[in-house]
């Protein structure tokens, strides 16, 4: 018996996604099956379906297929997140380019090459013809879309609406023309799914006909989506395993983009005198390794043979014999001219971010005994002996009085963020001093970050209002308004305090801002009864580099059914990996007809090391950052969401574990989000709330 072809390769997969029909007239068909492959075969052949199948959802929990005559681009349909669902959409219906003669093209272009509107296939006006949808089943002669039902030479065509012109080809580009890559295509994330000889690519999540190690779950940052060409291993260009059992793999015909510039997310900062990060952007002329042995030219194969040639690594500047880092090693390196030493690191190149501060502290600065007596904002410190009463109020031990001499910056309360002092200014009772940690000091201020030692939740049950648990209540969400427009999110952590991001305050004039609470719609429509509008009375900037701000409200918020506070985590706590969390915001959604309603994206906590791998090792996370990955590709925080919270639940208690800050990209597929770790700054937040005066309600 002839083996039926596996058609799942013809579908684009969106994990943890389903389609919901808003238009009740749309039909769907369901059936119990064992695998998504079975769903795909039936969808492709339209067997037993009362419509042309364009997409299907495989329900992994119920082992069920849902076939659709529509896809995510159809009107009357919306995408929805769901753990147990995987959405598969026939690529022919979402592709806007053609392969070969375009026989399989099922896109929606309906204008000819010269710009004439196409005549509907079911119409005989102005041109009579025999290309009836009923005669060409499976050729999708729908509406007035360009098609090539007989696979003719010129590609997709149509009868035109101009009586003078019977038919004309449509100007639909070849997929190989549309697709392009930069450098050697390591960052290529396009939709080419066949090789240069026309073989269809094997899905990366399949092991037939070829077994391989490139499993999407093992390499989440390599873009192993569906069966698209990729370059995960530093080859000269993208490739894929093929569906031909006799051809294991083949290169794909993807041309180099005309404007051969790399993506912003992939461009290392170019330096010539020093190394930034791992030195992938080092473009200097050092040409010896650490011990003085000269480097071998990159374009030479003597004394060491290699494939790290300028041709193979086009954007890595492999000129002459200069030290470079083309392959993501820990720092720039080169092959050496010594036949006995193949490679060596050029570790003599200095690091760019070595600070040369005269005054510095180690650890958290509790032993700092320098003479600085000014805060970072330029205020003169006040004498310690005048402030002992205040100090006793927020520490529970006797401070070492011998260290608290004069008005010098000190750290008597073991503050994680360094030396500080009282100011004598009633508006700013205390602040940190402009002292950096000493060069090369890596003493962590919190230990065991990736081992759950301290629970984040304070052991208490979820608060209940009027007898109903407020699990769905998001009353702590704040819309920060700048000149009457929403610009950022924030979290109400106390009646008078909102936690948000430093970058959310473009102006220093606090009259330019307002905080809106109790709203669901960004414009406050329909929220009149529950909305509270409060002015901003002060901004307290977080420790240096934190990107946090505590925004003090001019009067306390009134807590009610619509406005509530959200809890803070314990200081230095770790939330377990894979904990399910959410980010909330009114920001950019990618939709043109954005309805202004508060959106939520579901993420899960990822350890810092794993997170760094997802960012291709280009990002080293520190103890002040927390990472969470999207359950739905491309969902996550974006412009307008900054300042908003990453909310997680532990022991039935919801807490703000992270704050969304700019600089980490907008919901980038396969790149987990990096947030400010609130647990790292929890003591600072408590200290501010305790020491700064707030108006009474």
């Amino acid at each position: 018996q002839r083996k039926r072809r596996n058609t799942i390769h013809e579908f684009k997969k969106s994990a943890k996604t389903t389609l919901i029909k808003i238009d009740p007239a749309l039909k769907i068909k369901t059936k119990k099956v064992n695998t998504a492959d079975q769903c795909a075969n039936r969808c492709t052949r339209n067997k037993g379906l009362p419509f042309t199948c364009k997409a299907f959802v495989f329900d992994k929990a119920r082992k069920q297929c849902l076939w659709f005559p529509f896809n995510s681009m159809s009107s009357g349909v919306k995408k929805e997140f769901g753990h147990e669902f995987d959405l598969y959409e026939n690529k022919d219906y979402i592709r806007n380019c053609i392969i070969g003669k375009g026989r399989s093209y099922k896109g929606t272009v309906s204008i000819t090459k010269s710009g004439i509107k196409c005549q509907p296939w079911s119409s005989m006006i102005p041109h009579e013809h025999s290309f009836l949808p009923s005669s060409y089943r499976g050729k999708d002669l729908q509406e007035n879309y360009c098609r090539n039902p007989r696979g003719e030479e010129g590609g997709p065509w149509c009868f035109t609406s101009n009586p003078e012109v019977r038919y004309e080809v449509c100007d639909i580009p070849q997929c190989s023309e549309v697709e392009c890559m930069t450098c050697n295509g390591e960052s290529y994330r396009g939709l080419m799914d066949h090789t240069e000889s026309g073989k269809i690519c094997q899905r990366w999540d399949h092991q037939t006909p070829h077994r391989h190690k490139f499993l999407p779950e093992r390499y989440p940052d390599k873009g192993f989506d569906d069966n698209y060409c990729r370059n995960p291993d530093g080859q000269p260009r993208p490739w894929c395993y093929t569906l031909d059992p006799h051809t294991r793999w083949e290169y794909c015909a993807i041309k180099t983009c005309a404007d051969n510039t790399m993506n912003d997310t992939d461009v290392p900062l170019e330096t010539t005198e020093c190394i930034q990060g791992q030195g992938e952007g080092y473009r200097g002329t050092v040409n010896t390794i650490w011990n003085g042995i000269p480097c071998q030219r990159w374009d030479s194969q003597y004394p060491h043979e290699h494939d790290m040639t300028p041709e193979n690594f086009k954007c890595k500047d492999l000129r002459e014999n200069y030290c470079r880092n083309p392959d993501g090693s820990e720092s720039p390196w080169c092959f050496t001219t010594d036949p006995n030493i193949r490679v060596g690191y050029c570790s003599q190149i200095p690091n760019c971010d070595m600070s040369h501060g005269q005054d510095c502290y180690r650890g958290n600065g509790k032993n700092y005994m320098g003479n600085l007596s000014q805060t970072r904002s330029g205020l003169t410190c006040s004498m310690w002996d005048k402030n002992m009463e205040d100090l006793h109020r927020h520490i529970f031990w006797e401070p070492d009085a011998s260290k608290l001499n004069e008005n010098y910056c000190r750290n008597p309360d073991d503050d994680a963020h360094g030396p500080w002092c009282y100011t004598g200014n009633p508006l700013i009772p205390w602040d940190y001093c402009p002292i950096s940690r000493c060069e090369g000091d890596t003493t962590p201020t919190i230990v065991n970050l990736d081992h759950p030692v301290i629970s984040c939740a304070k052991t208490k049950q979820l608060r209940v209002v009027n007898g109903i648990p407020t699990r769905t209540n998001i009353g702590w969400m704040v819309s920060l308004r700048y000149r009457n427009k929403h610009i950022c999110g924030g979290s109400l952590i106390k009646e008078s305090w909102v936690l948000t991001a430093r970058q959310c305050f473009p102006s220093r004039d606090l009259k330019d801002y307002e905080a809106w609470l109790g709203i669901h719609d960004v414009h406050g429509r329909g929220d009149e009864k529950c909305k509270q509008v409060l002015n901003v009375s002060q901004l307290v900037y977080g420790p240096e580099g934190s990107d946090l701000v505590l925004m003090k409200l001019a009067r306390p918020a009134v807590l009610d059914d619509f406005v509530s506070t959200i809890d803070l985590p314990n200081y230095g706590c770790t939330i377990p990996e894979k904990t399910s969390c959410s980010v909330y915001g009114w920001g950019y959604t990618g939709l043109i007809n954005y309805d202004g309603l508060l959106r939520v994206a579901h993420l899960y906590i990822m350890g810092n090391e794993k997170c760094s791998q997802h960012h291709r090792g280009k990002v080293t996370l520190n103890e002040s950052e927390i990472c969470a990955g999207a359950e739905k590709i491309g969902s996550g925080p974006c412009e307008g969401d900054y300042g908003g919270p990453l909310v997680c639940e532990q022991h039935k208690m919801r807490m703000v574990l992270g704050v969304i800050v700019p600089g980490r990209g907008c919901a980038i597929p396969n790149r987990p989000g990096i947030f400010v770790r609130v647990a790292y700054y929890a003591k600072w937040i408590h200290k501010i709330i305790l020491t700064y005066k707030v108006p009474q309600s």
Partner: antibody
Framework: EVQLVESGGGLVQPGGSLRLSCAAS????????ISWVRQAPGKGLEWVGV???????DYASSAQGRFTISRDNSKNTLYLQMNSLRAEDTAVYYC?????????????WGQGTLVTVSS | DIQMTQSPSTLSASVGDRVTITCQAS??????LAWYQQKPGKAPKLLIY???KLASGVPSRFSGSGSGTEFTLTISSLQPDDFATYYC????????????FGGGTKVEIK
């Protein structure tokens, strides 16, 4: 080298449109606020508009409703789209990096590009 | 909205002179003020920020002072290279602002 390079200037008729570009190198445009400043021949500096790190924009009253600032992070480039141009928009247009993420002083300037609005 | 008024608009001085330029804000801008120097055909160059902090690479003969609404740029001993136009700029807020810069002061040779 850290620098800003403006382009796209030229002669345009009153009522016409023009798009200026400001290409950054050595730093990323999304990590600082960036502003456009213009200078009419023989006149002083006039602030035009700014795009902050968070993507929000502010404009001078003379530019409000006619000019739009945007950025393309993937190209590391800032743009100034100018519509309904008038003779009084004739000037050298500079893009300038603002220190930090919000409104502040300018610590890096481009060389400028000349826009002439004339029939 | 904040307006910046600079005076004088032109100033004639000789090499070695002590030169003072003032800038007035229509409302308090705390210390959020910057000073720039511009030579013909060139882009402006930052001299002073936050009213009194010297920008990197700027000679120490330049100094700034003031806070609130009144600010001053002083060149302690005018050098040949200092003949240029100087601008102040408020770095406080640009909400509803016509121009963030002062009108400029041209320092010319006497």
């Amino acid at each position: 080298e850290v620098q800003l390079v403006e382009s796209g200037g030229g002669l345009v008729q009153p009522g016409g449109s023009l798009r200026l570009s400001c290409a950054a190198s050595g730093f990323t445009v999304s990590s600082n606020a960036i502003s456009w400043v213009r200078q009419a021949p023989g006149k002083g500096l006039e602030w035009v508009g700014v795009i902050y790190v968070i993507g929000v924009t502010d404009y001078a009253s003379s530019a409000q409703g006619r000019f739009t600032i945007s950025r393309d992070n993937s190209k590391n480039t800032l743009y100034l789209q100018m519509n309904s141009l008038r003779a009084e928009d004739t000037a050298v247009y500079y893009c300038a990096r603002v220190y930090d993420s919000g409104w502040n002083h300018f610590n890096l300037w481009g060389q400028g590009t000349l826009v002439t609005v004339s029939s | 909205d904040i307006q910046m008024t600079q005076s004088p608009s032109t100033l004639s001085a000789s090499v070695g002179d002590r030169v003072t330029i003032t800038c007035q804000a229509s409302q308090s801008i705390s210390s959020w003020l910057a000073w720039y120097q511009q030579k013909p055909g060139k882009a402006p160059k930052l001299l002073i920020y936050e009213a009194s902090k010297l920008a990197s690479g700027v000679p120490s003969r330049f100094s700034g002072s003031g806070s609130g609404t009144e600010f001053t740029l002083t060149i302690s001993s005018l050098q040949p290279d200092d003949f240029a136009t100087y601008y102040c700029q408020q770095a406080y807020s640009v909400a509803n602002v016509d121009n963030a810069f002062g009108g400029g002061t041209k320092v010319e040779i006497k």
